[in-house]
Interface confidence: low
């Protein structure tokens, strides 16, 4: 029953011209064109799409025109590689020209960049944007789709043009209003909040398909889905997971055009047989296409079905385990994950798969012994252990969260993960260190039934950004083996990693503790990152050092920005009592 | 799709010793386990050893100290020595492979041990 099986086309490009419409076109051409090339001119990349958008026309006109029955790895690859300055720019990206498809575009995909030596975006003057969005509407909303792309070469396409649209809103409400940074500022935030989120929520899902195949990102999706919508019947979700990972993995592969086009048929598909999905559907259909896709995703949990039998029956109970797991081990997996997910919303995904896991693993063991049903009978009694860890650790750091508060409940996750992972650079321990803290405000506020899953598949999401950060430049195997053995395990596996005995500490280098009258000048945000930045340092001089050691030079260094940023000469204060901080923190922590 | 070809097996006396290989192909980067399984004539399949990619390994009691399991990367080959062999470990073993579960299977090698 899948959605997506289309009568071939002469030309796929005129297809997916059709289907999509020049404005989507456009915008989809040349998010992907920046996800690849990540440091070309946004000039290039608009005279790149133009060129692409007037050929696609002429395919429209006559499908049997010349090179209009080439595929789009093929078209698209031709016109990324007419760039002029690709070797100087690129180096050995430029190889990937000399492929041939589908090699080719393997190629691209794997100089695709997670952390590009680009410049931090900074938010100019309210008036200065408006007067840009006023002068050229369709170029200011071209800049932003290609800023954020090439940022987050693996953002999902279509959810970036509901970013934009929501941008391009933005602006034209605001900038006629009477307080325009009023208006406009806290949108703006809201859209980077949660850009930056869906950025790593959707780089989880391509890391789950290409590190660990389809098989891991359909498991996923038979476990949220479920969960999602437990009144469907498993072959509804099974056909949903099926499209859903078309989907996923067009987008992580970069044809970001069938992409779109098959999300939408999705969308619409969910949509017309929504009495058989879901009864929280209703508001999102009623929507425009790309706010229907963006609610779909989002859409709460249906309520569970009432009259749910035990699972044991069918999973422990029953004398065919064993014959129905043989016969189709995936389609029995399937289900036991179908019906363990609807049964428990409370579940984080990653632990309802830890759970399948164990359960395949057992008949895997016990359908080989001489008496299966004696061996597997208590199999549910070894879901135990795996639920109760992330119930008992989502409880403590929940407490640590509400005694310290999110600023100084990220400093105690920074001391525990630099000492886990020392080798680990300062601004990925950081960078992730935070995030990680920000799951207490996140999830820590929800009731009991839904702190799991908000929690742990958000750690996951994380925990992901810190694979994907070191996987560019390996420094700890600690961390490889955590990210690379079970994706299911991941956050278990680094919760589990003590302090690394093996860590040589850091040389003592004042000057990385020396600070001036510019932190003073900076937003609170940034002022708090400086000084995390400096507690990493810290911890990584001196690993052993304790918590109270670590809280009082914490405090001095809090004391020492404060006095010398109400000082008259603030710069002379830092040189001065700088000296003095960097002395003390040496003798309070024996450096 | 992966594919996996067993190689290795034969007739091998009581005590004796034997390495199965098993060579993997196609979408391998994906592979976080590997494993060997093995039926003997009439009986149902047994878990022989486990490898996972960061290399740790599991094995039953029954194989334990006579097996090995081992994995070489670069040539996308898995290996098994095993040494001591009794006659109960006589059977077709199969190689497995999978990103969550083990879902691709080989065709199996014939090991007899026997005097």
């Known amino acids: 029953r899948g959605v997506f099986r289309r009568d071939a086309h002469k030309s796929e490009v005129a297809h997916r011209f059709k289907d999509l419409g020049e404005e989507n076109f456009k915008a989809l051409v040349l998010i992907a064109f920046a996800q690849y090339l990540q440091q070309c001119p946004f000039e290039d990349h608009v005279k790149l799409v133009n060129e692409v958008t007037e050929f696609a026309k002429t395919c429209v006109a006559d499908e049997s025109a010349e090179n209009c029955d080439k595929s789009l790895h093929t078209l698209f690859g031709d016109k990324l590689c007419t760039v002029a300055t690709l070797r100087e720019t690129y180096g050995e990206m430029a190889d990937c020209c000399a492929k041939q498809e589908p090699e080719r575009n393997e190629c691209f995909l794997q100089h695709k960049d997670d952390n590009p030596n680009l410049p931090r975006l900074v938010r100019p003057e309210v008036d200065v944007m408006c007067t840009a969005f006023h002068d050229n509407e369709e170029t200011f909303l071209k800049k932003y789709l290609y800023e954020i792309a090439r940022r987050h070469p693996y953002f999902y396409a279509p959810e970036l043009l509901f970013f934009a649209k929501r941008y391009k809103a933005a602006f034209t409400e605001c900038c006629q209003a009477a307080d325009k940074a009023a208006c406009l500022l806290p949108k703006l935030d809201e859209l980077r909040d949660e850009g930056k989120a869906s950025s790593a929520k959707q780089r989880l899902k391509c890391a789950s398909l290409q590190k660990f195949g389809e098989r891991a990102f359909k498991a996923w999706a038979v476990a949220r889905l479920s969960q999602r919508f437990p009144k469907a019947e498993f072959a509804e979700v099974s056909k949903l997971v099926t499209d859903l990972t078309k989907v996923h993995t067009e987008c992580c592969h970069g044809d970001l055009l069938e992409c779109a086009d098959d999300r939408a048929d999705l969308a619409k598909y969910i949509c017309e047989n929504q009495d058989s999905i879901s009864s929280k559907l209703k508001e999102c259909c009623e929507k425009p296409l790309l706010e229907k896709s963006h609610c779909i995703a989002e859409v709460e949990n249906d309520e569970m079905p009432a009259d749910l039998p035990s699972l044991a029956a069918d999973f422990v109970e029953s004398k065919d385990v064993c014959k129905n797991y043989a016969e189709a081990k995936d389609v029995f997996l399937g289900m036991f994950l179908y019906e363990y997910a609807r049964r428990h919303p409370d579940y984080s995904v990653v632990l309802l798969l830890r759970l399948a896991k164990t359960y395949e693993t057992t008949l895997e063991k016990c359908c080989a012994a001489a008496d299966p049903h004696e061996c597997y009978a208590k199999v549910f009694d070894e879901f135990k252990p795996l639920v109760e860890e992330p119930q008992n650790l989502i409880k403590q750091n929940c407490e640590l969260f509400e005694q310290l508060g999110e600023y100084k409940f990220q400093n105690a996750l920074l001391v525990r993960y630099t000492k886990k992972v020392p080798q680990v650079s300062t601004p990925t321990l950081v960078e992730v260190s935070r995030n990680l803290g920000k799951v207490g405000s996140k999830c820590c506020k929800h009731p009991e039934a839904k702190r799991m899953p908000c929690a742990e598949d958000y750690l996951s999401v994380v925990l992901n950004q810190l694979c994907v950060l070191h996987e560019k430049t390996p420094v700890s195997d600690r961390v490889t083996k955590c990210c690379t053995e079970s994706l299911v395990n991941r956050r278990p596996c680094f919760s589990a990693l003590e302090v690394d005995e093996t860590y040589v500490p850091k040389e003592f280098n004042a000057e990385t503790f020396t600070f001036h009258a510019d932190i003073c000048t900076l937003s609170e945000k940034e002022r708090q990152i400086k000084k995390q930045t400096a507690l990493v340092e810290l911890v990584k001089h001196k690993p052993k050092a304790t918590k109270e050691q670590l809280k009082a030079v914490m405090d001095d260094f809090a004391a020492f920005v404060e006095k010398c940023c109400k000082a008259d000469d603030k710069e002379t204060c830092f040189a001065e009592e700088g000296k003095k901080l960097v002395a003390a923190s040496q003798a309070a922590l024996g450096l | 799709e992966v594919q996996l070809v067993e190689s290795g097996g034969g007739l091998v006396q009581p005590g004796g010793s034997l390495r199965l290989s098993c060579a993997a192909s196609?979408?391998?980067?994906?592979?976080?386990?590997m494993a060997w399984y093995r039926q003997a004539p009439g009986k149902g399949l047994e878990f022989v050893s486990r490898i996972s990619k960061g290399g740790s390994t599991n094995y039953p009691d029954s194989v334990k100290g006579r097996f090995t399991i081992s994995r070489d990367n670069s040539k996308n080959t898995l290996y098994l020595q095993m040494n001591s062999l009794r006659a109960e470990d006589t059977a077709v073993y199969y190689c497995a492979a999978g990103p969550v579960w083990e879902q691709f299977w080989g065709q199996g090698t014939l090991v007899t041990v026997s005097s």
């Open positions: 196609g979408s391998i980067e994906s592979i976080n386990r």
